[in-house]
Every structure is written in C-alpha cells, then in structure tokens.
Amino acid sequence: ISYDSPDYTDESCTFKISLRNFRSILSWELKNHSIVPTHYTLLYTIMSKPEDLKVVKNCANTTRSFCDLTDEWRSTHEAYVTVLEGFSGNTTLFSCSHNFWLAIDMSFEPPEFEIVGFTNHINVMVKFPSIVEEELQFDLSLVIEEQSEGIVKKHKPEIKGNMSGNFTYIIDKLIPNTNYCVSVYLEHSDEQAVIKSPLKCTLLPPGQESESAESAK
C-alpha cells in the first residue's frame, strides 16, 4: 500500500470514531453518492508495520454504517490505516481510506443513565459495562449536570478504580415540588468538545410541610 502519494481526491466518506458504552465504534457517512451501497466491508492494517489489509470479520459485507472495533484496535499508540469499501451487489462503488489514532481521534459518547426523584434528592444511576479494558479508560471523568430554573450545577463524582459496573450518585439538598433536569457526560483531560446526554427531567414530590398545608385546606 502506498501511504504517501501526492495526488488526493476529496474523500467521499466522513468517519467518526467514538467510545460508546466503552466500545470503540467506527461510523461513517457518505458524501455525494448517487448510488447507495447495499453493503460495506471494512479492512485495516497498522501503519508502523504495514502488512496486507485485514478484513474485520464482523464488518465484512455488512449493511450497517458502523463497526465495533473494540477487539481489533487495542493500542492507543498505533495508527490504524482503515479502508472502507462500498458495494452494490458485486460492483465496488467506492473505496475510502483514513488513518486513526485513538489517543487523539476518539470522541466520547455519554453513558446510559436513569434518574429517580425523591422529595429532596435525586438518585442518578449511571450504567457502565461490567468490564472495561484498561486501554479504553482514556483518563476520563464522569460529569453529572443538574439544572433547575436556569441554574446549572456540575457534579464530578469520584469513582474508585475504573469505570465499570453500575454507579449511583445522589444529588442532594434539593427543593421539593421543583422540576430538575439531569445530563451526564464523559470529560476528557484534554480540551475536547464534550458530548452531553439528552436531559432527563423529574418533578420532585412535595415535602411534608406542603403536604400538611394542603390537607389543612
């Protein structure tokens, strides 16, 4: 493979590598394709030791526009030379290539979470996978944002060990009978744009005082 040819056409694919639920997911979008591919095949090699391109087994002849590379791409030091081939039936429509370096190219999707509202606190249950590879920890910290009446408060819970298994955080000292919204995201040690989760909102139940006041009426 020649990696350093001076003639380049504008790539016809846009790639994105994301850490989604602590899995390395490569996704792609096509630019200006009149014929939409029926399936794709993804191949790669390591740039420091270029060998024949290896087909990613679970992404050969796939109809999906993403590929889970967690078990293939294990190093945050290597650059992975990636080739995406698009087919319509037996005809090759296009081939796009790009090099990925996980340490700098990875974006971090927010974890799944649930909230349960109580009178004066909210339980935030963040779902992490039971086991997370050391290479995929990426020096990340969990951020929980609490919003109410235009005021945003950031919580940075300390997680002992690595981010694995379910994690519960309590946002306390809240005001009963008030609407609160919560968003979670993973913050990288670098100045990288964060991807925040959609807000989940709950109206806290009224407290004891307002309950007794209501019953007295």
Partner: antibody, heavy 117, light 112 residues
Framework: EVQLQQSGPELVRPGVSVKISCKGS????????MHWVKQSHAKSLEWIGV????????KYNQKFKGKATMTVDKSSSTAYMELARLTSEDSAVYYC??????????WGQGTSVTVSS | DIVMTQTPLTLSVTIGQPASISCKSS???????????LNWLLQRPGQSPKRLIY???KLDSGVPDRFTGSGSGTDFTLKISRVEAEDLGVYYC?????????FGGGTKLEIK
Amino acid sequence: EVQLQQSGPELVRPGVSVKISCKGSSYKFTDYAMHWVKQSHAKSLEWIGVISTYYGNVKYNQKFKGKATMTVDKSSSTAYMELARLTSEDSAVYYCARSYGSYLDYWGQGTSVTVSS
Amino acid sequence: DIVMTQTPLTLSVTIGQPASISCKSSQSLLDSDGKTYLNWLLQRPGQSPKRLIYLVSKLDSGVPDRFTGSGSGTDFTLKISRVEAEDLGVYYCWQGTHFPWTFGGGTKLEIK
C-alpha cells in the same frame, strides 16, 4: 518527498500574540496528527501538544495550556499555533512535526520567535 | 511528567572509533501494549531534528546500520560502531509512551 513548510521568523514585542504556521505537502494531510515542539537554549526540546488534523481534537502539555493554541485548516493542509502574552521566556525555535500514532517521523524546518522590546 | 536524563552532555570521538550515549527515564516506558516508545533523534548543526531510531531499536529508513539502539524499562543506549564525520550533532532521546511526551537534554557529539 514529505515536506512540512513553516512560516518565517518572528520578532515581536512582549505582551502580544504570534501565530505561526506549518503546511504539509506530498502526503495526505488529514491522515497524520501534527505536533508542536519548543527548542530553547535553557530547556532543550519541549513537547507543546498535538492536534488531530482530521477532527481538530487537541492534547496539550499542561505547561503550555493557556500559552499555546493549536488549530488546523484542512482545506489548505496547514496547522497553526498561536502563542499568547509573549515574554522573553517564549523566545525559541518552534517546530511542527507529524506523527502516525506515537511515531514522529518528519519535522518542519522550525520558526524562530524572538520576543524583545 | 517523565524525566529523561541523557549522559554524557558532550562526547568527543575520533573518526572510526565507537561512541555510546545513555538515556534513563524516571519511569518505565513499557506500555500495556507490550511496546516501548523510546526514540532517538539527531539534530545536525543548523538543521531540524531527524528521526534515527524508534521503538528502542528500529532504524529509520536511510539510517546506516552502524547505529544501534538497545535497552528496556528505564535504561536505554544508543551506540555508533564507527563514528563518521556526518554523525556530528546533538542526539536526543525522547519517550512517547506517556503524555506529555518528554525529551532528554541532548548529547553533543564532537569530532576530535
């Protein structure tokens, strides 16, 4: 042959900012990350940081956060580094260097920045 | 940050004689992927740095085989079997295992 062409020398007053450039040619620019390295007599070589030429993601050496800002313009295959609030300590030669993963393989010719009143 | 310490500061060698430069890191440079991202650069007078060796012992293309890199963990060595006039300049070791990447202070090779 791969080339990293850096902008010319800069003589600047203390307190101002300077933006230096590094244009990559004869290779696919967005396939390689771009690093910036400072070389001064006092401190030998110091790694400032790295930018993803495809996504624009950055990673800085803590020491240079707030001092250096790295950006990239894919359309012109050019990486930039702006140095803010310059002092005499910032007088140095600044190199760009490309990498594939953790492998730095080519360096620019360097840009000399002299801070003097 | 990892500190890279190079010795000697200056090395004065006769053409045709061997030379050896030591580089020590304050922490192990062996990564969890099994590789050691220890590299050597040469900066000739008035030029920008050029890669000589990467991954402890792999020579960059065009680098003569009189250069050898060795070592593991925290202790590394660059050896030149027979020094030639074109070898003069400053040699730097640097590590890319841990961010921020860090460089040694340099060793100036002079020709006697």
